[in-house]
């Protein structure tokens, strides 16, 4: 749940929303380590379910730029680099939380959705669907 | 970018903070369709970088829970179901929005904060470093 | 403190390629987009095309599509643009600028590298 | 492609006086707006953001308005060095485009 015991050094907020409308600071804080070697790897390249990321824009959206993933192929690529179809490249989603402007157009009111974004492809064994 | 053409139907903001302070609606839109098969998949099995989802909790946090996936192996999972130590499973990471309670235990004051989670694991070709 | 140090001028012939590197430093490599962007002599400021090295995603404005190529080499923490088949209007200079994605605007900027294609 | 015209081509105005350049964009960009100044030889700097944020360590005399389609940036006193070039842009949808800019110089 989200909801906490009110504290007197609070912002208000009027019952009636309470806590539906929330006041959100957009100053954002980052906690990731400054340097993360995982991220900033190539694993897009060099995995067996290898993927291309595309720049998603939507100005009525925060953050406004997505970039999504999608599998550059539709099996899996072997050690020789060639792509063997009885494996699967499948996109790994996840749902992310996004804050959308509403009402349109507005520049300091959004609502919180959310949305699933493709991050990377993982190589699947194919489920066999055997005919009696 | 983020901010909008001020509309005559959009809340009131002090320009002090404008916009770094907005009002967010957390009666969450969900756009994603009700029920989605790659999201209630089972690649976390059935990859050949399996893995193992963990519960994180942290009530000062909206959401509250996030899971995160943890690899089962160093290597990746052979045809035959034997770990193949020649490849290695590596967590695919995504940065993403959460709302953090500011100050602290506020019911209906928070600040953006970026995080990063692993989503799922892929089977990564090693980066071999050769000794001159 | 962060800076962006891009590679010397370059004078190339027509039909050419011309590969621009930029260096960044004082900041996580990966953590920024990084966007290309050009001015011809006396002219105005022309959008190339964007990369993420901490994912390795691009974007390219259309004019550019089939002739630019964005690179990025986390190990050197340095960004690239090529553009190949080059032509007498390619003469600009190319700027490398830092993106700030969720705040939504160019902070730093490259010094420039004058790029000249003459026969 | 979203146009971005700014106007006047070339700004005469003394040390000490203010100065307003505009900026149209050919539809709404909200206030995804940035201005950069630039002098001969230099990069580009960024001055505003968000159509009326003043960047860190810009001046207070530099400051930015509109939204939708257009926008001004003004300098409230001229000092001798804010004779430049100054850019319009607009990150609202790529490609991101440019004004072709508005030239300050002292009369």
């Known amino acids: 749940g989200i909801a906490i015991p009110r504290n007197s050094g609070c912002p208000n907020s009027e019952d009636k929303n309470f806590p539906r409308t929330v006041m959100v600071n957009l100053n954002i804080h980052n906690r990731n380590t400054s340097t993360n070697p995982k991220r900033s790897s190539d694993y897009y390249n060099r995995s067996t379910s290898p993927w291309n990321l595309h720049r998603n824009e939507d100005p009525e959206r925060y953050p406004s730029v997505i970039w999504e993933a999608k599998c550059r192929h539709l099996g899996c690529v072997k050690a020789d680099g060639n792509v063997d179809y009885h494996m699967n490249s499948v996109p790994i989603q996840q749902e992310i939380l996004v804050l959308r402007r509403e009402p349109r157009h507005c520049p300091n009111s959004f609502r919180l959705e959310k949305i699933l974004v493709s991050v990377g492809c993982t190589c699947v064994t194919p489920i066999v669907h055997h005919v009696a | 970018g983020i901010a909008i053409p001020r509309n005559s139907g959009c809340p009131n903001s002090e320009d002090k903070n404008f916009p770094r302070t907005v009002m967010v609606n957390l009666n969450i839109h969900n756009r994603n369709t009700s029920t989605n098969p790659k999201r209630s998949s089972d690649y976390y099995n059935r990859s050949t970088s399996p893995w193992n989802l963990h519960r994180n909790e942290d009530p000062e946090r909206y959401p509250s829970v996030i899971w995160e996936a943890k690899c089962r192996h160093l290597g990746c999972v052979k045809a035959d179901g034997n770990v193949d130590y020649h490849m290695n499973s590596v967590p695919i990471q995504q940065e993403i929005l959460v709302l953090r309670r500011e100050p602290r235990h506020c019911p209906n004051s928070f600040r953006l904060e970026k995080i990063l989670v692993s989503v799922g694991c892929t089977c990564v070709t090693p980066i071999v470093h050769h000794v001159a | 403190e962060v800076q962006l140090v891009q590679s010397g001028a370059e004078v190339k012939k027509p039909g050419a390629s011309v590969k621009v590197s930029c260096k960044a430093s004082g900041y996580t490599f990966t953590d920024y987009e990084f966007h290309w962007v050009r001015q011809a002599p006396g002219q105005g400021l022309e959008w190339i095309g964007v990369?993420?090295?901490?994912?390795?995603?691009?974007a390219y404005n259309q004019n550019f599509r089939d002739r630019a190529t964005l690179t990025a080499d986390k190990s050197t923490s340095t960004a690239y643009m090529e553009l190949s088949s080059l032509r007498s209007e390619d003469t600009a200079v190319y700027y490398c600028?830092?993106?700030?994605?969720?705040?939504?605007?160019?902070?730093?900027w490259g010094q420039g590298t004058l790029v000249t294609v003459s026969s | 492609n979203i146009v971005m015209t700014q106007s006047p081509a070339t700004l005469s105005v003394s040390p000490g006086e203010r100065a307003t350049l505009s900026c149209k964009a050919s539809q709404s960009v909200s206030i995804d707006v940035g201005w950069f100044q630039q002098k001969p030889g230099q990069s580009p700097r960024l001055l505003i953001y968000?159509?009326?944020n003043r960047y860190t360590g810009v001046p207070a005399r530099f400051s930015g308005s509109g939204s939708g389609t257009d926008f001004t940036l003004t300098i409230s006193s001229l000092q001798p060095e804010d004779f430049a070039v100054y850019f319009c842009q607009q990150d609202y949808s790529s490609p991101y485009t440019f004004g072709q800019g508005t030239k300050l110089e002292i009369k």
């Open positions: 600028t830092r993106f700030l994605t969720y705040e939504g605007y160019f902070d730093y």
């Open positions: 990369i993420h090295p901490g994912n390795g995603g691009t």
């Open positions: 968000h159509a009326s």
